[in-house]
């Protein structure tokens, strides 16, 4: 026969059980707080170091570009892609339209000083983007030339010249003495034309976006 529990013993058991439950709860909460604090500090430190890195990168680039325009990119919107102000951006590149009239070689040197090259056009979409910002009564040098006049066209950045991805106007190129390419508006569309390299024209510079 099992002896009956005394009321005070029952109360003692309940109290002891509650104490254990509360202890576990308090310890768990404390652990959660500690974890949260640690992760917050770690996350803060991570974010802080990322910001510091970004700022130092920005300062580094500001030696060359007084002002950068940046947008957030990437799946977590954590990366910044930047172009010098007032360059425009398209896909992974930045573009600058120079209205200074210069020879082809001088135009390329001018782009080079800014960390860029005369524009290399790789797709119709890229050309369509560029031409939105051009004046239809002007011509602009491209980074495309044929220095020997042998009709061996070459891009300034050594991108292979692909005849299938060219946008020459009808009948162009048409003269071995015209060894540099421009983009201009003719017959209701934008296209390329070969011209004398020494004749001053406007130009378009292109550079890779700056990622920070």
């Amino acid at each position: 026969m099992v002896p009956e529990e005394e009321p005070q013993d029952r109360e003692k058991g309940v109290w002891w059980f509650q104490l254990k439950v509360w202890s576990v709860a308090v310890v768990s909460i404390l652990l959660l707080c500690v974890c949260f604090t640690v992760s917050s500090v770690a996350s803060h430190n991570f974010m802080y170091s990322k910001t510091v890195k970004r700022l130092s990168k920005l300062q580094e680039y500001q030696q060359y570009y007084p002002s950068l325009t940046c947008v957030m990119e990437g799946k977590d919107m954590e990366d910044w892609s930047c172009c010098p102000t007032p360059w425009t951006s398209f896909q992974s590149s930045c573009y600058f339209i120079s209205t200074v009239m210069q020879s082809w070689t001088k135009s390329q040197n001018n782009c080079s000083v800014m960390g860029a090259d005369l524009v290399v056009i790789n797709t119709k979409e890229e050309q369509d983007f560029i031409t939105q910002n051009l004046k239809i009564n002007s011509a602009y040098f491209l980074g495309l030339s044929d220095p020997k006049g042998w009709r061996h066209w070459q891009w300034v950045d050594q991108t292979p010249y692909n005849k299938n991805v060219t946008f020459w106007h009808s009948g162009e190129p048409n003269s071995p003495d015209e060894r540099c390419a421009i983009i201009n508006f003719r017959s209701e569309e934008w296209g390329w034309n070969d011209v004398h390299c020494h004749v001053p024209q406007k130009s378009i510079c292109k550079m890779k976006k700056i990622y920070i």
């Epitope: 020879s103 001088k106 540099c180």
Partner: antibody
Framework: EVQLVESGGGLVKPGGSLRLSCAAS????????MSWVRQAPGKGLEWVST????????YYPDSVKGRFTISRDNAKNSLYLQMNSLRAEDTAVYYC??????????????WGQGTTVTVSS | DIVLTQSPASLAVSPGQRATITCRAS??????????MHWYQQKPGQPPKLLIY???NLESGVPARFSGSGSETDFTLTINPVEAEDTANYFC?????????FGGGTKVEIK
């Protein structure tokens, strides 16, 4: 043999006009850019104007812009320089020269003997 | 405009000696491996005659005693050895950018 023969020079009063001609032979005239270059007495060479092979491009220095006009007639193998509103400082020997393209620029590989223009009252 | 400055303005050289003429451009007339400076000889009463194109290429028919060198802004025409018939004016010229320009000339006299 490449030959360039200038003609049309002479004595003219300030404000007057002259038309210089350059007859080319010995090469395919229509395939070459051409220029006029002048040399004042005892002075250096000064480029005066350029015309591309296909006549699509002409260029002048500020000193003659609006007064001189370069032109060509490929059928006649001839180059011309129409000079209006002549000034004393235009006095010089005028040479026509053939352009040869070299990489991104050009040089003058053949020159005519020159024709003398004197502007004086 | 690109200004070309030649030196010296005149030069007297003994036959068999070396004559060196320099031409300095107000800005670069080179692009990568292309050096776009040219040299001419002009004898009294005659038109200019091409000697050197592209800084160092000898024009066909020009004697090998003429040579050219240089890049960017500094170019040199060398005559070695000088001969009596080399008495003439020598001009440098660029046309990397319009307008094409000439140096002021160097008068070479044979002693």
């Amino acid at each position: 043999e490449v030959q360039l023969v200038e003609s049309g020079g002479g004595l003219v009063k300030p404000g007057g006009s002259l038309r210089l001609s350059c007859a080319a032979s010995g090469f395919t005239f229509s395939s070459y850019g051409m220029s006029w270059v002048r040399q004042a007495p005892g002075k250096g060479l000064e480029w005066v104007s350029t015309i591309s092979s296909g006549d699509s491009y002409t260029y002048y220095p500020d000193s003659v812009k609006g007064r001189f006009t370069i032109s060509r007639d490929n059928a006649k193998n001839s180059l011309y320089l129409q000079m209006n509103s002549l000034r004393a400082e235009d006095t010089a020997v005028y040479y026509c020269a053939r352009q040869i393209y070299y990489d991104y620029a050009y040089y003058f590989d053949f020159w005519g003997q020159g024709t003398t223009v004197t502007v004086s009252s | 405009d690109i200004v070309l400055t030649q030196s010296p303005a005149s030069l007297a050289v003994s036959p068999g000696q070396r004559a060196t003429i320099t031409c300095r451009a107000s800005e670069s007339v080179s692009f990568r491996t292309s050096h776009l400076m040219h040299w001419y000889q002009q004898k009294p009463g005659q038109p200019p005659k091409l000697l050197i194109y592209g800084a160092s290429n000898l024009e066909s028919g020009v004697p090998a005693r003429f040579s050219g060198s240089g890049s960017e802004t500094d170019f040199t025409l060398t005559i070695n050895p000088v001969e009596a018939e080399d008495t003439a004016n020598y001009f440098c010229q660029q046309s990397i950018e319009d307008p094409p320009t000439f140096g002021g000339g160097t008068k070479v006299e044979i002693k």
